[in-house]
C-alpha cells in the first residue's frame, strides 16, 4: 500500500543488500512542500519494520540523526537472513485522530556470498542425448544468485548456460543442449560452475571428463523371448540397443522370487540364450547396457518383460496312499489317494491322472483317467493287487508311481511299538514310535496317517499321511491339524508285501469338554447295573477324551459321591457297576476327562436297584 513515494524518499547505507551481521542506516526524507500542513515543525517521521507482511517493530528509538520536519536516519541491526521491509510514515502530531501517512519504503536483503559449487556430475542420456550437469550449491545464500555452467573441449569448443536461485526456485542443474558424439570418445572436456550474487562470487574446481565417462546408454527396448521348440527351460532373449553398446547385463527371476539371476553378455548384439529356466513359471526379465567394457556407466534397467515359460512333461513321482475296506463277502473297495505334484515337478497344468489297478497273477487290469486326486474301485478280495498313478500335462506324463495293495494292519509282527503322540503347539503333533520287534521282513518305509475323530465321508475327507524313511522313528504332523480336535493316528510299517500298524489318539490343543455324556438308560441284570450313554457331540469334546467317570451317591446324601473311571472307547456306550445297595435310591451322572481336565456333569438319573446286595 505504499503510494509510489509521492511524499518523500527512503535510502539505505551502505546498500539494500548486506551480509549477515551487518548494520544499515535507513534515511527517510520528505520532498519539498510535503509534510503536515500549517505546522512543518510538527512533522514526525517514524520507521516501521515488517517481516512476512507482519509489523514486528517501531524503530522510533533507533534514530541516529534528525532534521526536524525534513528527514530522519535510523540504524537497524541484527537483521535475520532473508528480506525485511521497512516503511517510513509521517505522523502529524497536531491531529491525533489521523493515522500516520506512508511516505516510502525499502527492502533490505540479508544473505551470504555463494560457496564454490561442488560435486559436479555430467551425463548424456543416450548417443543422441544432450549434456546435462548438476552440482551441489552449498549453503543457501538467501539472495538471488546466478550460476553459469561453462564447458570447454577440443577444437576450441566452448558453451555456456545460466540459471539463478532465489527464494522460489533452486538452480543446481543445467542442460547445455549440446550432443557429444562417439567420434570424440577419447577427448577430454572441462566444465566449471561460477556463482555470483550481490555479496560476492565463487567458482568450482574444474571438472574433467571424457565421452565414455558421461554417456549413459538408453535402456534396451522391445524385449522379447523365443522358446526353442517350445522348450520350457531354454529360450533366446532378444532386444534392441543403441549401436555402440558392447556389454549387457541381464537379470531374471520367477515372479515370486526375491533374488535375481544375473548374467553378463559381451557383444551380445541384442540376443542371448538362457538355458536354466524353470518350465511353466512366470518370469520377469530386465536388461541394462554399457558402451565400454571397463569404463562408462550402465544404463537404467529396461522395462520388465513378464512371461511364462512353456510346459514340459511332469517329473518326480506321486505320493500315493490307499484305503481298503471289505464291502461284501468277496469284494473289497480300494480307494486310492495321491498328493498333487509341486509346481517344479508338475511343470505345467496337470490335466488328468492315469490310474491303473492290476491283479498280478491273473493279469486283470483296470485303467481310468481322472481329474481328481482320488479314485475308487470295487475289486475281488482275492489276488495280489498293485496300483500305479501318473500325472499328465499337455506335454506328457510323469513316470508311474507303483504301490502294492496289502492288508495295511494285517501283520502283527510288523506293528510299530511304543507309539506316542505329543502336542507340540496349536497346529502340530509329534508322533514317535519304536520299530517292530520281530518283523519277518525288512521295513521299507513307515507311513504316518491321521484322520479326525469326527464323522466324515471317505472320499470327501481323504486321509492325511506322511512317508517316513525306515531309519526315522518320528514325524511332526501339521497338515490339517486343528486345535481342540482329536485325531486317530496310525503308524504303518510296510515291507514289500505286508503291513502292520499301531494306533494312537492325539490332539494339538485341548480343553475340558463342554459337557458330560448323557445317560440314556440304567438297567439291572444279574445283580449288576448297566449304565448306557450317548457320547458327547464331537464339537463339544474339545480334544481327545481320555476317560469317562460314572458318579453315584445316595439321594439326599451330602457325602462325597463314589466314582468309577473307564477308559474311553468310541465303540463302548455302556458299563456295569456292582457296588450299589438294593432298595436304595441313587443319583447317577457322568463326566468326561481330557488332558486339560474334567467336563461339567452330564444329566442326572435316579435309580433304585432291586436285587440282592453284592
Amino acid at each position: 500500500n505504499i503510494d509510489v513515494c509521492k511524499l518523500g524518499t527512503v535510502t539505505v547505507q551502505p546498500a539494500p543488500v548486506i551480509p549477515l551481521g551487518s548494520a544499515a542506516n535507513i534515511s527517510c526524507s520528505l520532498n519539498p512542500k510535503q509534510g503536515c500542513s500549517h505546522y512543518p515543525s510538527s512533522n514526525e517521521l517514524i520507521l516501521l519494520k515488517f517481516v512476512n507482511d507482519v509489523l514486528v517493530e517501531n524503530l522510533h528509538g533507533k534514530k541516529v540523526h534528525d532534521h526536524t520536519g525534513h528527514s530522519s536516519t535510523f540504524q537497524v541491526t541484527n537483521l535475520s537472513l532473508g528480506m525485511t521491509l521497512f516503511v517510513c510514515k509521517l505522523n502529524c502530531s497536531n491531529s491525533q485522530k489521523k493515522p500516520p501517512v506512508p511516505v516510502c519504503g525499502v527492502e533490505i536483503s540479508v544473505g551470504v556470498a555463494p560457496e564454490p559449487p561442488q560435486n559436479i556430475s555430467c551425463v548424456q542420456e543416450g548417443e543422441n542425448g544432450t549434456v546435462a550437469c548438476s552440482w551441489n550449491s552449498g549453503k543457501v545464500t538467501y539472495l538471488k544468485t546466478n550460476y553459469t555452467l561453462q564447458l570447454s573441449g577440443p577444437n576450441n569448443l566452448t558453451c555456456q548456460k545460466q540459471c539463478f536461485s532465489d527464494n522460489r526456485q533452486n538452480c543446481n542443474r543445467l542442460d547445455l543442449g549440446i550432443n557429444l558424439s562417439p567420434d570424440l570418445a577419447e577427448s577430454r572436456f572441462i566444465v566449471r560452475v561460477t556463482a555470483i550474487n550481490d555479496l560476492g562470487n565463487s567458482s568450482s574446481l574444474p571438472h574433467t571428463f571424457t565421452f565414455l565417462d558421461i554417456v549413459i546408454p538408453l535402456p534396451p527396448w522391445d524385449i522379447r523371448i523365443n522358446f526353442l521348440n517350445a522348450s520350457g527351460s531354454r529360450g533366446t532373449l532378444q532386444w534392441e540397443d543403441e549401436g555402440q553398446v558392447v556389454l549387457n547385463q541381464l537379470r531374471y527371476q520367477p515372479l515370486n522370487s526375491t533374488s535375481w539371476n544375473m548374467v553378463n553378455a559381451t557383444n551380445a548384439k541384442g540376443k542371448y540364450d538362457l538355458r536354466d529356466l524353470r518350465p511353466f513359471t512366470e518370469y520377469e526379465f530386465q536388461i541394462s547396457s554399457k558402451l565400454h567394457l571397463s569404463g562408462g556407466s550402465w544404463s537404467n534397467w529396461s522395462e520388465s518383460l513378464r512371461t511364462r515359460t512353456p510346459e514340459e512333461e511332469p517329473v518326480g513321482i506321486l505320493d500315493i496312499w490307499y484305503m481298503k475296506q471289505d464291502i461284501d463277502y468277496d469284494r473289497q473297495q480300494i480307494s486310492l489317494f495321491w498328493k498333487s505334484l509341486n509346481p517344479s515337478e508338475a511343470r505345467g497344468k496337470i490335466l488328468h491322472y492315469q490310474v491303473t489297478l492290476q491283479e498280478v497273477t491273473k493279469k486283470t487290469t483296470l485303467q481310468n483317467t481322472t481329474r481328481h486326486t482320488s479314485w475308487t474301485r470295487v475289486i475281488p478280495r482275492t489276488g495280489a493287487w498293485t496300483a500305479s498313478v501318473s500325472a499328465a500335462n499337455s506335454k506328457g506324463a510323469s513316470a508311474p508311481t507303483h504301490i502294492n495293495i496289502v492288508d495295511l494292519c494285517g501283520t502283527g509282527l510288523l506293528a510299530p511299538h511304543q507309539v506316542s503322540a505329543k502336542s507340540e503347539n496349536m497346529d502340530n503333533i509329534l508322533v514317535t514310535w519304536q520299530p517292530p520287534k520281530k518283523a519277518d521282513s525288512a521295513v521299507r518305509e513307515y507311513i504316518v496317517e491321521w484322520r479326525a475323530l469326527q464323522p466324515g465321508s471317505i472320499t470327501k475327507f481323504p486321509p492325511h499321511w506322511l512317508r517316513i524313511p525306515p531309519d526315522n522313528m518320528s514325524a511332526l504332523i501339521s497338515e490339517n491339524i486343528k486345535p481342540y480336535i482329536c485325531y486317530e493316528i496310525r503308524v504303518h510299517a510296510l515291507s514289500e508285501s505286508q503291513g502292520g500298524c499301531s494306533s494312537i489318539r492325539g490332539d494339538s490343543k485341548h480343553k475340558a469338554p463342554v459337557s458330560g455324556p448323557h445317560i440314556t438308560a440304567i438297567t439291572e441284570k444279574k445283580e449288576r447295573l448297566f449304565i448306557s450313554w450317548t457320547h458327547i457331540p464331537f464339537p463339544e469334546q474339545r480334544g481327545c477324551i481320555l476317560h469317562y467317570r460314572i458318579y453315584w451317591k445316595e439321594r439326599d446324601s451330602t457325602a462325597q459321591p463314589e466314582l468309577c473311571e473307564i477308559q474311553y472307547r468310541r465303540s463302548q456306550n455302556s458299563h456295569p457297576i456292582s457296588s450299589l445297595q438294593p432298595r436304595v435310591t441313587y443319583v447317577l451322572w457322568m463326566t468326561a476327562v481330557t488332558a486339560a481336565g474334567e467336563s461339567p456333569q452330564g444329566n442326572e438319573r435316579e435309580f433304585c436297584p432291586q436285587g440282592k446286595a453284592n
Partner: nanobody, 119 residues
C-alpha cells in the same frame, strides 16, 4: 445318525424294468458314496453298485450295462434304474452309506425293498 428309506420295488417280468429310490435324512452332511446291495433268499448280501459325490459309479460285473445308479444331491436321493431284469436279480435291495470316524467305518442301512423277477 443317518436314516435311509428305500422304495420302488415290486414284481416284474423278465426283461422288464424297475427304478428303485433311496432318500437319506438325519446327519447327512458327511454322506458321500451311496451304495446299493442286494440279498437273495439263502444267499449272502452282495454289493450291486455305488456312486460318489462326483458321480463316478462302479457296478457288480453281472449287472454292468443293465443297471444304472444316479443321484440327486438336492433331494438327498440315490436311484437304481434296473433294465433287462433277470430271475436271478430277485432279492431284497438295500440302500447303504458309510461314514468314517477316525479309521472306523460306520455303516447305515435302509430296511430294504423287495424286487421279484418272475413270469
Amino acid at each position: 445318525q443317518v436314516q435311509l428309506q428305500e422304495s420302488g420295488g415290486g414284481l416284474v417280468q423278465p426283461g422288464g424294468s424297475l427304478r428303485l429310490s433311496c432318500t437319506a435324512s438325519g446327519s447327512i452332511f458327511a454322506i458321500d458314496d451311496m451304495y446299493w446291495y442286494r440279498q437273495a433268499p439263502g444267499k449272502q448280501r452282495e454289493f450291486v453298485a455305488y456312486i460318489t459325490a462326483t458321480n463316478s459309479a462302479n457296478y457288480l460285473d453281472s449287472v454292468n450295462g443293465r443297471f444304472t445308479i444316479s443321484r440327486d444331491n438336492a433331494k438327498n436321493s440315490v436311484y437304481l434304474q434296473m433294465n433287462s431284469l433277470k430271475p436271478e436279480d430277485t432279492a431284497v435291495y438295500y440302500c447303504n452309506t458309510k461314514q468314517i470316524v477316525g479309521f472306523q467305518i460306520d455303516e447305515y442301512w435302509g430296511q430294504g425293498t423287495q424286487v421279484t423277477v418272475s413270469s
